[in-house]
């Protein structure tokens, strides 16, 4: 169908406009590359050649003034559907006295170089040459919309044609589609949809879970306010114009929920007083994790069942649980939270601390000479069970003998049974300094405070013991 539209909705004067849905006269392949314009030489009308448009030089030049050169008026506005073909042209008659004329096509202020299908034909006469520059597009796209003009350079002057407005009409084209969102249950949120023609207007219908939301269409752009959801929903919008309808992508609106518990917990390392754990978070409930809680309780059935809670950041899914008892069994659970709340605790897992060296020294260390004066008797109390940090395997006794100019240190190992030891006198008329440490497989604990006893010369006996008091007995 062809229809004259004398004054379309574009600024500027036009002689007319054309709405066309017919295929072009020229079925040239639509290419995106560049190629030189085809031209027919006036001297050899049937043979195309490439190069600048050049009017054949005329030898005799008349002196009478020439009328101003101008492109002839042509169709000013062409409306057509997307993917159709179009051909338009501009024509001009140029006196033969002019040489080196070139015609170029411009769109929206930019020169169209190369492979747009531009053909220039020459029709020479005695005094003038009619030039028709044709431009064809075999399958128009939205990007072909715009204002096209011809320019001719002649003797350093530029002649510009009236614009030809190409309006490519098609199905609505989305410039803004709804976006997936994670929303709080029963809380209002907005979705936006915007589509453009031509042709305008574009009307919007909203669709929720395959059902239309609005009975009456809204002009684009449209904002849908959803008062709140209780479960996940899929929204899309339909954009309608005279050419038909386009449906946006469907977007999922998720309802934020409490997270799932972690799917894995790993015991990375254990020491006497700490356990390093890592975890793999569960599903986040459509809301980022904020922090995590590590719950620890003694696995011993005789324990009081109290739970220690360690809070940490959600990342890096790693935590060192500290201040634990040595050689103890623990149950560990991990829970993480998002803005909605805490996940359930993961299934409880078991972990143990290793043996450590005792954390305190033996108590009540007492040292005295026995009756024969050949030995020093040492007595002590074992460290409290909680502070042994393992199973006692024995004790290490350090005894230092000091007399004028002599100092001698000896170490003794004694078994775990009992709490006494006897050491031989090494030097008479000397001071013996005794310290004792408890030993587990985890190592040697701290030594007790030194206890000194004087060992007299032969024949002098002092039975008074030396001792370190037990804590609280001082």
């Amino acid at each position: 169908r062809e229809e004259a539209k004398p004054y379309p909705l574009f600024p500027g004067p036009f002689p007319g406009s054309l709405q066309t849905d017919h295929t072009p006269l020229l079925s040239l392949p639509h290419a995106s590359g560049y190629q030189p314009a085809l031209m027919f030489s006036p001297t050899q009308p049937g043979r195309p050649h490439t190069g600048n448009v050049a009017i054949p030089q005329v030898t005799s030049v008349e002196s009478k003034p020439l009328p101003p050169l101008a492109f002839k008026h042509t169709v000013g506005h062409i409306i057509l559907s997307e993917h159709k073909g179009v051909k338009f042209n501009c024509s001009i008659s140029v006196p033969n006295i002019y040489q080196d004329t070139t015609i170029s096509w411009w769109k929206d202020g930019k020169e169209l170089l190369g492979a747009h299908h531009a053909i220039t034909q020459f029709y020479p006469d005695d005094e003038v040459t009619a030039i028709i520059a044709s431009f064809s597009i075999t399958s128009v796209q939205r990007s072909d919309n715009g204002s096209y003009i011809c320019k001719m350079k002649i003797n350093n002057e530029e002649i510009v044609s009236d614009p030809i407005y190409i309006e490519v009409q098609g199905l609505p084209h989305f410039t803004k589609q709804p976006e997936s969102m994670n929303v709080t249950r029963n809380t209002a949120f907005n979705l936006t949809c915007q589509a453009v023609g031509p042709p305008e207007p574009v009307n919007i219908f909203w669709v929720q879970n395959s059902s239309r939301v609005n009975e009456q269409p809204e002009k684009s752009p449209s904002v849908l306010t959803v008062p709140g959801l209780t479960e996940m929903a899929v929204f899309s919008c339909e954009a309608h114009n005279d050419k038909g309808l386009t449906v946006s992508k469907g977007v999922q609106i998720n309802i934020k929920a409490i997270p799932s518990p972690p799917t894995e917990v790993s015991i990375r390392n254990s020491t006497a007083h700490s356990i390093l754990i890592s975890w793999v978070p569960g599903f986040d409930g459509y809301s980022p994790f904020r922090n995590c809680s590590i719950q620890v309780k003694e696995a011993d059935p005789l324990s009081n069942g109290s739970v220690m809670i360690f809070n940490t950041s959600a990342l890096p899914h790693l935590y060192q649980i500290k201040q634990l008892q040595a050689l103890a069994n623990y149950s560990i659970g991990v829970s993480c939270m998002n803005e909605i709340g805490w996940s359930a605790v993961s299934p409880w897992i078991l972990a143990s601390t290793t043996e450590g060296a005792p954390s305190v020294a033996p108590l009540n260390v007492t040292v005295f000479l026995n009756e024969s004066s050949d030995n020093v008797d040492i007595r002590w109390m074992k460290p409290p069970t909680k502070q042994q940090d393992g199973e006692l395997v024995g004790y290490r006794i350090s005894h230092v003998w000091q007399s004028a100019g002599i100092s001698k240190e000896l170490l003794e190992e004694v078994g775990q049974n009992g709490s006494r030891a006897r050491i031989s006198v090494q030097v008479h008329n000397a001071t013996c300094t005794v310290r004792i440490a408890a030993v587990t497989r985890g190592g040697v604990g701290p030594f007790s405070d030194p206890v000194k006893i004087f060992i007299p010369a032969h024949g002098w006996v002092d039975y008074a013991p030396s001792s370190t008091p037990a804590p609280g007995n001082a």
Partner: antibody, heavy 128, light 111 residues
Framework: EQQLVESGGGLIQPGGSLRLSCAAS????????MSWVRQAPGKGLEWIGI???????YSASWAKGRFTISKDSSKNTMYLQMNSLRAEDTAVYFC??????????????????????WGQGTLVTVSS | DAQLTQSPSTLSASVGDRVTITCQSS????????LSWYQQKPGKPPKLLIY???DLASGVPSRFSGSGSGTEFTLTISSLQPDDFATYYC???????????FGGGTKVEIK
């Protein structure tokens, strides 16, 4: 919808090799341990092995050496490579998601809490 | 290797009956409660029913219940329904061992 789909089963001659695949959808293998379980015709379930979310693998003692579990997280797919197949390996092979898993890295073992999602299974027949 | 022994291996019952299946472990289950029960129908994969010895999996009817700790566990169906005729497996893990052991199964059939 969360689901598991096994593939790669079929008829294989004794001594041959086969690779089974388990494609997961609706959840990520990067966040879940996965397991293989088999069931000989008319028999009970037999655990084959597990691959943790980080890619550590643990296998039943009978499966070590012949069966290898691996995964491609970018394809969200787990695999079971079976070598030196025998007639007694004839079974339906199921892949299953591990609902929770505890790993003891220092001791190189891990324990499954539960298998909460199963595939339909793929039949492997070893016969000459 | 630890073993799970289920009894009985076959059980004939009628709709409405109360059904009890036991599962005995040769050593203590991890954390004393990491035992699960699965239901399997012919030609179908197993389905998780119960975990942590007594917690019902999502979507499982309340007529199913589990109990026990350590080495002795029980699955009870309070009132057998037509949909419950199937084979039931217990399964669990153990400290110090990666193996996930399945019981031999109990087939619940129509009397």
């Amino acid at each position: 919808e969360q689901q598991l789909v096994e593939s790669g089963g079929g008829l294989i001659q004794p001594g041959g090799s086969l690779r089974l695949s388990c494609a997961a959808s609706g959840f990520s293998l990067s966040s879940n341990a996965m397991s293989w379980v088999r069931q000989a015709p008319g028999k009970g379930l037999e655990w084959i092995g597990i691959i943790s979310s980080s890619g550590s693998t643990y296998s039943a003692s009978w499966a070590k050496g012949r069966f290898t579990i691996s995964k491609d997280s970018s394809k969200n797919t787990m695999y079971l490579q079976m070598n030196s197949l025998r007639a007694e390996d004839t079974a339906v092979y199921f892949c299953a998601r591990v609902g929770f898993f505890v790993g003891y890295g220092a001791y190189d073992y891990g324990i499954i809490h539960r298998l909460d999602l199963w595939g339909q299974g793929t039949l492997v027949t070893v016969s000459s | 290797d630890a073993q799970l022994t289920q009894s009985p291996s076959t059980l004939s019952a009628s709709v409405g009956d109360r059904v009890t299946i036991t599962c005995q472990s040769s050593k203590s289950i991890y954390n004393n409660n990491w035992l699960s029960w699965y239901q399997q129908k012919p030609g179908k994969p197993p389905k998780l029913l119960i975990y942590d010895a007594s917690d019902l999996a999502s979507g499982v009817p309340s007529r199913f219940s589990g109990s026990g700790s350590g080495t002795e566990f029980t699955l009870t169906i309070s009132s057998l329904q037509p949909d419950d005729f199937a084979t039931y497996y217990c399964a669990g893990g153990y400290s110090g061992d990666s193996d996930y052991a399945f019981g031999g199964g109990t087939k619940v059939e129509i009397k």
